[in-house]
Structure formats: C-alpha cells, structure tokens
Interface confidence: low
C-alpha cells in the first residue's frame, strides 16, 4: 500500500511563482516542494507576472477516497502575456515583432496549448485501485480572450459519482489544470 495517506499533494512550481494567475481563477498554491522560475530576479511573492510561463508541476491526484500511487508530472501555464521587450523567455515568439501594450495584454492569457492523455492508477485506503484517464498539459501559449471567456481553474470530467478529482498544486498558483475522467 504505497500511499499510506493522501488526499492530494500539491504541485511544484518553478522559481518565483506569481502570486496570482492572469486569469481570474485562483489556484491552490502548488505542492510538494514547489520550484520557482529560473533567474527572473523576482521574489516568489512578487505581485508582478513575468510572462506566459510553463511551470513544471508534480502532484498527486485524488478523488477524495483514493490517491495516485506516484506523482503526476505536467506543465502548468501561468502568467500574463506581456510586451515582448520585457520577456526574455517569452513563449509565443512565432508572433515575431508583434508588440502588445500593457493595456491590450490584459486581453491575452497564458493558456494550455498542447495536451496528452494518459492513464493513472489511484490506490484506495481499502487496498483497491481505480484507473482514471487524464489529460495533462505539455505546452502553453498566449491566447486572446474576449470578455465572455471566463475559464475556471480546474476542468474535471469525472464520470464517477465521487467528488471530482482534485489537483493539489502547492507549488505555484497557476491557471488551468488537467482534465480528469474516470475510465
């Protein structure tokens, strides 16, 4: 019984994790250790986003009763899409010399770009196991949003009557999380 105890572990982040995501969703802080962004020179508690970042996340998945046997690794997209000149490692360089002012950058969000599906096994306290099919993020991008777009932090597609699977990301505050569905 590998996981003696669990609900959900949080996920880690890379260096200073932004204090608030660019979308209006608020995520649990990431988890188990949490990494920070590399060399941004920003304090982890800074209120300033440093751009659309791919944060490596490591977390356990739980549906309330059962927990994944080992941590799940994925990317979490976080940050604002700020003007090119202030983003040394900006994701979305394909936009070339396109320059967004700070004002218009508020219409752009750092969101999931590429994903992949994988199965994970959850171990339950009674010794049984459950299998979930989840979608994990593998790349992020800046995307233009109109006002009516208001995505929630977590999109769960749990087919079971149990509580929705929860991510615990304690490593960072990021936006958009994996989708989970019972398989």
């Amino acid at each position: 019984f590998k996981n003696d105890a669990t609900e959900i572990l949080y996920s880690h982040v890379v260096k200073p994790v932004p204090a608030h995501p660019s979308s209006n969703s608020t995520l649990n802080q990431a988890r188990n250790g949490g990494r920070h962004f590399s060399n941004t020179g920003l304090d982890r508690n800074t209120r300033v986003q440093v751009g659309c970042r791919e944060l490596r996340s490591t977390k356990y998945i739980s549906d309330g009763q059962c927990t994944s046997i080992s941590p799940l690794k994925e990317l979490v997209c976080a940050g604002e899409c700020l003007p090119l000149p202030v983003l040394p490692n900006w994701i979305g360089g394909g936009y070339g010399t396109k320059y967004w002012s700070r004002r218009s950058s508020q219409e752009w969000r750092c969101v999931n770009d590429k994903t992949r599906t994988q199965r994970i096994q959850l171990q339950c306290q009674d010794g049984s196991t459950r299998t979930y099919k989840i979608t994990v993020v593998t790349a992020c991008k800046c995307k233009r949003y109109t006002r009516q777009h208001n995505e929630s932090s977590h999109n769960f597609e749990s087919m079971s009557p149990a509580k929705p699977v929860q991510h615990h990301r304690e490593r960072k505050r990021a936006s958009k999380s994996s989708k989970h569905s019972m398989s």
Partner: antibody, heavy 118, light 107 residues
Framework: QVQLVQSGAEVKKPGSSVKVSCKAS????????ISWVRQAPGQGLEWMGW????????RYNRKFTGRVTITADESTSTAYMELSSLRSEDTAVYYC???????????WGQGTLVTVSS | DIQMTQSPSSLSASIGDRVTITCQAS??????LNWYQQKQGKAPKVLIF???NLAAGVPSRFSGSGSGTDFTLTISSLQPEDIATYYC?????????FGQGTKVDNK
C-alpha cells in the same frame, strides 16, 4: 500574510481525548491542505495527517488511524485535530501546517503542547 | 513507509565553516524532498524545496542538492543564527516522513 494560530496547552489523563484547534487567516482556507505534525520532547517531526478544507477530505498516517480525526470548519477557517485513547507517549507539541509554494509545510502554527500524565 | 536517514545526528562547527548534512531515503524519491530548519522552541521553517530550490527569504548560503536517494544540505558559511536542528522530509509517497534531524551547534 498567512497565519495559523493554535489553541493553548492541554494536560490530559491517559485514555482521554484532546482536541486542538488551528485558526487560519490570510489566503483561501477552502482551497488548501492543513496538516498536523507532532514532535515529542527532544524528538523529530511526525506527520499525522491532513485535511483538504474545501471538501473535508482527509488522509491519515497509518500509525494514527483510528485514533486521530482531523476536521475543518470553513465558516471560521479553523482546522481541528482530535487524538483519542491518549497515552504518555502522545506527550508532544502538536503543530498545524499549511501548504504553500514551498511545500506541504510552508506555514506553521505556533504549536500546542499536550501533556498526557496520570 | 519511506525511511529518511540523516547524518550526522549532530555536529559542532565554527562560525564561517562550511557545513554539510546528508539525508538518505530508503527508496528513490526523485527530487521530492524539502529541508527545514527548527530553532529551539519554535516551529520549523522551510529552507529548500524540491531538493535544490531556495525558499523565499532564505539566505543564499543555504543550498540543497541530490536526487533519487541521496541528498545534501550545505551551509556555505555558518552564521550564529544558523544554530538549529535541520530536518529533511520526503513527499514522494504518503505518509510524508521526516529524517530524525541533525543538530548543529557552535564549536
């Protein structure tokens, strides 16, 4: 600024129960994990279990299963840890700890000393 | 349960010394390891997360390294305020477990 404030010291008799509280301020209580960690005098740290405040979901260290109950009251942003069938070896400082960017135990309460003595 | 073994259990060092504490896990825990500092009568404080990342507000003289089963906490130049007990903690699997601690005092 996240802060965890615990209830005061307790002296208990063997076989009785103790319930320690941990009031959280700052941050979002409902979307966080609160763990309980204990430390016997002169000893190391021992994780007892946690609660995810938003759902009330708990997980316990097998060592304490059946004796420990962790609960949370969202309306007061308070987590509780109740330990039953107390014995002298349960004499320890009990800490609540909240997850944060740096791990499961980023923010700590000040600790509550529970003394079990006849 | 994953056992975490720290060594040494205690050490004496002079101010300015380089101090190294090791932590060994009973099985591979990737880099799912944190280091904490605990001063007498106080709650622990996180120093390093994910084995090698410095927590907010922690002086740069502290560093962590390692992956798998063997990990190290290094204090490059011991300061008077570093006199404390240090714990490693794994979160690769539940239950979350700590090392037994390494007490660092002044020579």
């Amino acid at each position: 600024q996240v802060q965890l404030v615990q209830s005061g010291a307790e002296v208990k008799k063997p076989g009785s129960s103790v319930k320690v509280s941990c009031k959280a301020s700052g941050g979002t209580f409902s979307s966080t994990y609160i763990s309980w960690v204990r430390q016997a005098p002169g000893q190391g740290l021992e994780w007892m279990g946690w609660i995810y405040a938003g759902t009330g979901g708990t997980r316990y260290n097998r060592k304490f299963t059946g004796r420990v109950t962790i609960t949370a009251d969202e309306s007061t942003s308070t987590a509780y840890m109740e330990l039953s069938s107390l014995r002298s070896e349960d004499t320890a400082v009990y800490y609540c700890a909240r997850e944060g960017v740096d791990g499961w135990f980023t923010y700590w309460g000040q600790g509550t000393l529970v003394t079990v003595s006849s | 349960d994953i056992q975490m073994t720290q060594s040494p259990s205690s050490l004496s060092a002079s101010i300015g010394d380089r101090v190294t504490i090791t932590c060994q896990a009973s099985q591979d825990i990737n880099n799912y390891l944190n280091w904490y500092q605990q001063k007498q009568g106080k709650a622990p404080k996180v120093l390093i997360f994910d084995a090698s990342n410095l927590a907010a507000g922690v002086p740069s003289r502290f560093s962590g390294s390692g992956s798998g089963t063997d990990f190290t906490l290094t204090i490059s130049s011991l300061q008077p305020e570093d006199i404390a007990t240090y714990y490693c903690q794994q979160y690769d699997n539940l239950p979350l477990t700590f090392g037994q601690g390494t007490k660092v005092d002044n020579k």
